[in-house]
């Protein structure tokens, strides 16, 4: 899987897609999970609706939320008020029984609110960004 | 209905390599997993892999590859499995099985007749 | 791999009777257990799913509880139709596994 990156502004809300084959993945409760370091386990943010039926209803964690259109095949999680430590590497899950099949590997950018100057060396300005091989960035 | 019928019985040296057949029929072909199941004579059963032929995307028990490919064929509605290398303890019945996913997990529902495959000198 | 252990390979029992076949996971399985009856011939039906869920078409004598690691199958009002090994499964984790089976004959 290569990594998709999405990029957010500090204090505002981050809106992740996750497209999915709807027939392949029939049935399955999805979910959102934050990677620990390189190969440590992934672990689970949020996830669907415990009926599939009802995967359409947003389920929140805090401040992240996800809901499922499980016709058109598009998992979308929602972080609300983004701040520097929610930047990282997650991954859209599909899941059966114990299994969790990765369906798309994200990793989410926090810019600095240009508005904001309070805390700016925390944050990750457009020039220090890591290089990620095929990465592809959505805003 | 749902129908899976499975290649008739084969006889294979030891070392030859063997493709056997599931013909699907009474559903949509491309939009169910299909699962391969193996049972030697008097012996229990084994997942041997699953396969989505909407992209042929296929997952497999780690005794298993290397030994077994699944593919599939859109239009002909029909999964197959190659085995490869072949020796005596390849020797059993391989049934394919649709898959349906029932309270969050895959379920084997419809199951084809088996192939037994004997290999022998 | 999670082992599926069927202690019973073969039970012999009667018509009318009640009969339970019983089937252990080396590990949680979170209820993710199917029975799956082989009859005589070789054909394969699945009977319950979810340890308790009845397929559609499956007789009610059929049923099937548990939880954890232990889960078992009952035969309510036994038939002579219902000779058949019976297998569990666990669809929990990958790879998928199945028990022994157990042979079930008519006295």
């Known amino acids: 899987h290569n990594t998709t990156v999405f990029q957010g502004v500090a204090g505002q809300s981050l809106q992740v897609s996750c497209p999915y084959d709807s027939m392949k993945h029939w049935g399955r409760r999805k979910a959102w999970c934050r990677q620990l370091g390189e190969k440590g386990p992934c672990q689970r943010v949020v996830s669907t609706h415990n009926l599939w039926l009802l995967s359409f209803l947003r389920r929140w964690n805090g401040s992240t939320a996800i809901t499922d259109d499980t016709l058109g095949g598009t998992l979308t999680i929602t972080l609300r008020n983004l701040q520097p430590h929610d930047a990282g590497l997650y991954q859209c899950q599909s899941l059966h029984g114990s299994e969790a099949d990765t369906l798309r590997k994200v990793l989410v950018e926090v810019l600095a609110d240009p508005l904001d100057h309070r805390d700016a060396g925390d944050l990750w300005f457009p020039g220090e960004s890591e290089s990620f091989e095929d990465a592809h960035v959505e805003h | 209905q749902v129908q899976l019928q499975e290649s008739g019985p084969e006889l294979v040296k030891p070392g030859a390599s063997v493709k056997i057949s599931c013909k699907a029929s009474?559903?949509?072909?491309?939009?169910?997993?299909m699962n391969w199941v193996k049972q030697r004579p008097g012996k229990g059963l084994e997942w041997i892999g699953r396969?989505?032929?909407?992209?042929?995307?296929?997952d497999y028990n780690g005794k298993f590859k290397g030994k077994a490919t699944l593919t599939a064929d859109k239009s002909s509605n029909t999964a197959y499995m190659q085995l490869t290398s072949l020796t005596s303890e390849d020797s059993a019945v391989y049934f394919c099985?649709?898959?349906?996913?029932?309270?969050?997990?895959?379920?084997?529902?419809?199951w084809g007749q088996g192939t037994l495959v004997t290999v022998s000198a | 791999d999670i082992q599926m252990t069927q202690t019973t390979s073969c039970l012999s029992a009667s018509l009318g009777d009640r009969v339970t076949i019983s089937c252990r996971a080396s590990?949680?399985?979170?209820?993710?257990l199917s029975w799956y009856q082989q009859k005589p011939d070789g054909t394969v039906k699945l009977l319950i799913y979810?340890?308790?869920k009845l397929h559609s078409g499956v007789p009610s004598r059929f049923s099937g509880s548990g939880s954890g690691t232990d889960y078992s199958l009952t035969i309510g009002n036994l038939e002579q139709e219902d000779v058949a090994t019976y297998f569990c499964?666990?669809?929990?984790?990958?790879?998928?596994?199945f028990g022994g089976g157990t042979r079930l004959e008519i006295k």
């Open positions: 979810y340890t308790s």
């Open positions: 499964q666990q669809g929990d984790t990958l790879p998928w596994t």
């Open positions: 396969i989505y032929p909407g992209d042929g995307d296929a």
């Open positions: 009474g559903y949509i072909f491309s939009y169910s997993w």
């Open positions: 099985a649709r898959l349906h996913i029932y309270d969050g997990y895959y379920v084997s529902v419809y």
């Open positions: 590990q949680d399985i979170n209820n993710y």
